[in-house]
Amino acid sequence: ESWEPCVEVVPNITYQCMELKFYKIPDNIPFSTKNLDLSFNPLRHLGSYSFLRFPELQVLDLSRCEIQTIEDGAYQSLSHLSTLILTGNPIQSLALGAFSGLSSLQKLVAVETNLASLENFPIGHLKTLKELNVAHNLIQSFKLPEYFSNLTNLEHLDLSSNKIQNIYCKDLQVLHQMPLSNLSLDLSLNPINFIQPGAFKEIRLHKLTLRSNFDDLNVMKTCIQGLAGLEVHRLVLGEFRNERNLEEFDKSSLEGLCNLTIEEFRLTYLDCYLDNIIDLFNCLANVSSFSLVSVNIKRVEDFSYNFRWQHLELVNCKFEQFPTLELKSLKRLTFTANKGGNAFSEVDLPSLEFLDLSRNGLSFKGCCSQSDFGTTSLKYLDLSFNDVITMSSNFLGLEQLEHLDFQHSNLKQMSQFSVFLSLRNLIYLDISHTHTRVAFNGIFDGLLSLKVLKMAGNSFQENFLPDIFTDLKNLTFLDLSQCQLEQLSPTAFDTLNKLQVLNMSHNNFFSLDTFPYKCLPSLQVLDYSLNHIMTSNNQELQHFPSSLAFLNLTQNDFACTCEHQSFLQWIKDQRQLLVEAERMECATPSDKQGMPVLSLNITCQMNKT
């Protein structure tokens, strides 16, 4: 092909020419190309109009191309280019007009390019620039040059992993001249030891990230004091998992934050073994969103009812016990992948609408009632990937629920009463892999609005699917895979007029019957893969609903013998519906084992007597 040795990803649009030992820009790529990856080629030098042949380019990746010199107008023809990636090039000579002509550039990545200063970086004319990433360079001064006043669309400035030690008032002078309240600034992994008080006064940022910047607690405290007067929508403090300098916090560690205006706060990778956490977060009582990620905490019973947080996130933290959470204003709680507290204890969150308690290995002595969460406003509840959850209440006071996820938790007492009876607004329910054994036909009674039901990996009494879906008139998606099913009631799906996707894969069906699907006028996808289907269980196989577009019968045990000729012919007749038909193979007889069913030509003669 003309573009070889490059790889055509999307014809005429996207080409990958990575690591092909090119010394020059290839000339066999279509003019219409929009995305071009030339990374890991020893280009070394970019002369003027290097990309004249690609006027439509939107994304150009020149990572690690050993580029040392970029001449004036190297990208002159690329008026549509939105992303330019120069990561890992040891640039020594960058002409003043190196980036001229890039009138649409929105993202410039110059990570690890030996950049020593922003002052001489010739990007002042790139008015459309939204994201500038100059991380992992040799920049020592945080002075934002005057040309920044032209970059009125700038939203992300990544200066992480540079050599910035001091931040002075004059460094940020240009930000006073421009209304860049949308700017997100990442200064992580710079060895900062001084921020001049007033440097950030009256400056507005969307996000400021300071992670693994400080050698010790005192430096951190004084630097936080230096942020006084900053108005920031989101502040991220802390460290990285592999870059830990701070030993232990004391209660005054974050006192300086009282002099900032913060909307959302996140603390990452710190050890916080304080007796009273409330002191630490006193200055953050009024933020709307509060997040702790990978923080070791001795006790969190001390979150005060007066904290005005609306969103609390506690992720991958370590607790001695499940925290006492009593927060008046909280609307969203994400408490996931935490360690320590093994048993859930009730929380008092009267405004709560969204609750994610997944992946904590928690046991619940009872579930679920408004009294567990202290709210009647809950719409979203995720209790997936936990331990034993005993279903002992039918969601009293939680009738507003729309999304409920129990997957991979161990549900007890599921077949004793209609657990979900009051959940008339529930749209999504996942009880996959919950050790549920369906032995009660009323298990899903009351779920009148349900659209998605996932119950893979459970089991049924006598491996028989009874009429348990009678209330689910709005169901569009049903997953019954891996349920050890062998038989189903002919009327099991009769009320599911809106069902579009039905997954019956990975069960133990030995025959296929179209009869149960006759009342599914909306069915589009039926998956019967990974069963043991040999044949049909009645002579007259009817047609599937006309809406059906995809039928998956792969990895079954087709019996390719004369007695099943009509079934095999019927399968051939469904050819236009079949998914991955080439994976439908004969299992018996042995001489036909592994042969594709669709290529089989069975000629059977009747014995005349």
Epitope: E301, G366, S369, D372
Partner: antibody, heavy 118, light 107 residues
Framework: QVQLQESGPGLVKPSDTLSLTCAVS?????????WHWIRQPPGKGLEWMGY???????DFNPSLKTRITISRDTSKNQFSLKLSSVTAVDTAVYYC???????????WGQGTLVTVSS | EIVLTQSPDFQSVTPKEKVTITCRAS??????LHWYQQKPDQSPKLLIK???HAISGVPSRFSGSGSGTDFTLTINSLEAEDAATYYC?????????FGGGTKVEIK
């Protein structure tokens, strides 16, 4: 509106077992919350005794753990207290109460006085 | 267990006067402290939850403050119907415990 009503004998002999029942109306005890017993000796302060959770789980004050049992009958919507081996110091007004999601008690029964005396 | 110490045990106050009752916890309990009012031959009635949050229906003259170990219940302008015993209760950890009570009498 949730209402709680204690009932049981007003006089119990020393070493016997004190038995009280709390009838609840306005909320099913198996539907949520935890249901508690609290007592108050004459002229003295309040002592929390223990509870039964809507799931059936129970927990007690360590000072009473060896003598106390709390059970329930969801069909009658009531829960019960048994306190064995009583002595004169167990003379008190016994209250049943519902605890909210926070550890406080907005709903109380009117209380019943139990005197331990021979 | 957490011990709550109330003071004073008894207070005799004239109507319209301001009443202050304190409750001290043996360890920090954040703001997990609640106040009850109990009139003779009645069951306790919840007044204030979480140190300072008034229960709906409770007159505005009742207010609470404090955090950590020291808490205060204030009745701003005492009325005759406020004659009762007032109890604090901690909800920080089990076993739940009550203060010894403060009896408020009208002079």
């Amino acid at each position: 509106q949730v209402q709680l009503q204690e009932s049981g004998p007003g006089l119990v002999k020393p070493s016997d077992t004190l038995s009280l029942t709390c009838a609840v109306s306005g909320y099913p005890i198996g539907g949520g919350y935890s249901w508690h017993w609290i007592r108050q000796p004459p002229g003295k302060g309040l002592e929390w005794m223990g509870y039964i959770h809507y799931s059936g789980y129970t927990d007690f004050n360590p000072s009473l753990k060896t003598r106390i049992t709390i059970s329930r009958d969801t069909s009658k919507n009531q829960f019960s207290l048994k306190l064995s081996s009583v002595t004169a110091v167990d003379t008190a007004v016994y209250y049943c109460a519902r605890k909210d999601s926070g550890n406080y008690f907005p709903y109380w029964g009117q209380g019943t006085l139990v005197t331990v005396s021979s | 267990e957490i011990v709550l110490t109330q003071s004073p045990d008894f207070q005799s106050v004239t109507p319209k006067e301001k009443v202050t009752i304190t409750c001290r916890a043996s360890q920090s309990i954040s703001d997990h402290l609640h106040w009850y009012q109990q009139k003779p031959d009645q069951s306790p009635k919840l007044l204030i939850k979480y140190a300072s949050h008034a229960i709906s229906g409770v007159p505005s003259r009742f207010s609470g403050s404090g955090s950590g170990t020291d808490f205060t219940l204030t009745i701003n302008s005492l009325e005759a119907e406020d004659a009762a015993t007032y109890y604090c209760q901690q909800g920080h950890s089990f076993p739940l415990t009550f203060g010894g009570g403060t009896k408020v009498e009208i002079k």
